[in-house]
Interface confidence: low
């Protein structure tokens, strides 16, 4: 398994609608045709998978229908958007990139983006 550098922003503030976007950029050592991008969340020393997508270079990222993530790719950059975030989802979101095909297999893991989520104040007439 060969290492690959992955860069991502240190801090991102989610919008009032609970949407956070950031760029994950990887230094591709070869001409990969198939790339897998995974977003991991690290909290309290636990790592959990948020979403993942495999894409062919030049094509769009396809996340599962029920995924909270969407994304677009451009060259060695992936623009990731995570939706539906609440204050409790604040944490470190790590971008993991795998160059799946052709061999050799490369794996790169970013240092993480701290996403801060602030729940909007409820409207005065809200029941919640």
């Amino acid at each position: 398994c060969k290492a690959m550098h992955v860069a991502q922003p240190a801090v991102v503030l989610a919008s009032s609608r609970g949407i956070a976007s950031f760029v994950c950029e990887y230094a591709s050592p070869g001409k990969a045709t198939e790339v897998r991008v995974t977003v991991l969340r690290q909290a309290d020393s636990q790592v959990t998978e948020v979403c993942a997508a495999t894409y062919m270079m030049g094509n769009e990222l396809t996340f599962l229908d029920d995924s909270i993530c969407t994304g677009t790719s451009s060259g060695n950059q992936v623009n990731l958007t995570i939706q539906g975030l609440r204050a409790m989802d604040t944490g470190l979101y790590i971008c993991k990139v795998e160059l799946m095909y052709p061999p050799p297999y490369y794996l790169g893991i970013g240092n993480g983006t701290q996403i801060y989520v602030i729940d909007p104040e409820p409207c005065p007439d809200s029941d919640f």
Epitope: L40, Q46, M100, Y101, P103
Partner: antibody
Framework: EVQLVESGAEVKKPGASVKVSCKAS????????ISWVRQAPGQGLEWMGW????????NYAQKLQGRVTMTTDTSTSTAYMELRSLRSDDTAVYYC??????????????WGQGTLVTVSS | EIVMTQSPSSLSASVGDRVTITCRAS??????LAWYQQKPGKAPKLLIY???ALQSGVPSRFSGTGSGTEFTLTISSLQPEDFATYYC?????????FGGGTKLEIK
């Protein structure tokens, strides 16, 4: 050091059930799944299914569906595999294995020592 | 299910030999293949994953190649501790399936 330690050998009668345990140590238990693989005497390896230690999701081999249940106890970092309605062709060594993981694919990087289950009348 | 066929089923070789084991999938599995080594009475040990990635701690004399339906495991120079049974495993599609194994014996 990652270790998976399985429970001891079992002898069961046809129709009975067996529950094998697998205690994990040396890594964050909830960051990986536990898969179960069995090997009949002198035969090859057969994947039985896996359980996510994070959320308890399972995926079982279709041929065992309805007879197998996999569970975990995160407080003790232990996985369990129960096989019911045992038949003679269930006689095998049962292995637990680490995987899949969040940072790995559906392959198995650490294995338990194996538990021999003998089904005989 | 995807059927994994290994060849040969058994193989005799000498220390220092170069050995190649083949694994064929009944349908394309991309690079989603792992290789394991198993010694009698012991659990399998992961050697290669993603068709060509060497597992940490595994000697560099082991290498894997292939994609799609045909894969090979090569041991460049056999050592005494390499005599064992080798299995391939696909992790492209449920159910995960293993090859029937290749028993590598001393000539």
């Amino acid at each position: 050091e990652v270790q998976l330690v399985e429970s001891g050998a079992e002898v069961k009668k046809p129709g009975a059930s067996v529950k094998v345990s697998c205690k994990a140590s040396g890594y964050t238990f909830t960051s990986y799944g536990i898969s179960w693989v069995r090997q009949a005497p002198g035969q090859g390896l057969e994947w039985m299914g896996w359980i996510s230690a994070y959320n308890g999701n399972t995926n079982y081999a279709q041929k065992l569906q309805g007879r197998v249940t996999m569970t975990t106890d995160t407080s003790t970092s232990t996985a369990y595999m129960e096989l019911r309605s045992l038949r003679s062709d269930d006689t095998a060594v049962y292995y637990c294995a680490r995987g899949p993981g969040i940072l790995t694919g559906y392959y198995f990087d650490y294995w338990g020592q194996g538990t021999l289950v003998t089904v005989s009348s | 299910e995807i059927v994994m066929t290994q060849s040969p089923s058994s193989l005799s070789a000498s220390v220092g030999d170069r050995v190649t084991i083949t694994c064929r999938a009944s349908q394309g599995i991309n690079y989603h293949l792992a290789w394991y080594q198993q010694k009698p009475g012991k659990a399998p040990k992961l050697l290669i994953y993603a068709a060509s990635a060497l597992q940490s701690g595994v000697p560099s004399r082991f290498s894997g190649t292939g994609s799609g339906t045909e894969f090979t495991l090569t041991i460049s120079s056999l050592q005494p501790e390499d005599f064992a049974t080798y299995y391939c495993q696909q992790f492209n599609t449920y159910p995960l399936t293993f090859g029937g194994g290749t028993k590598l014996e001393i000539k």
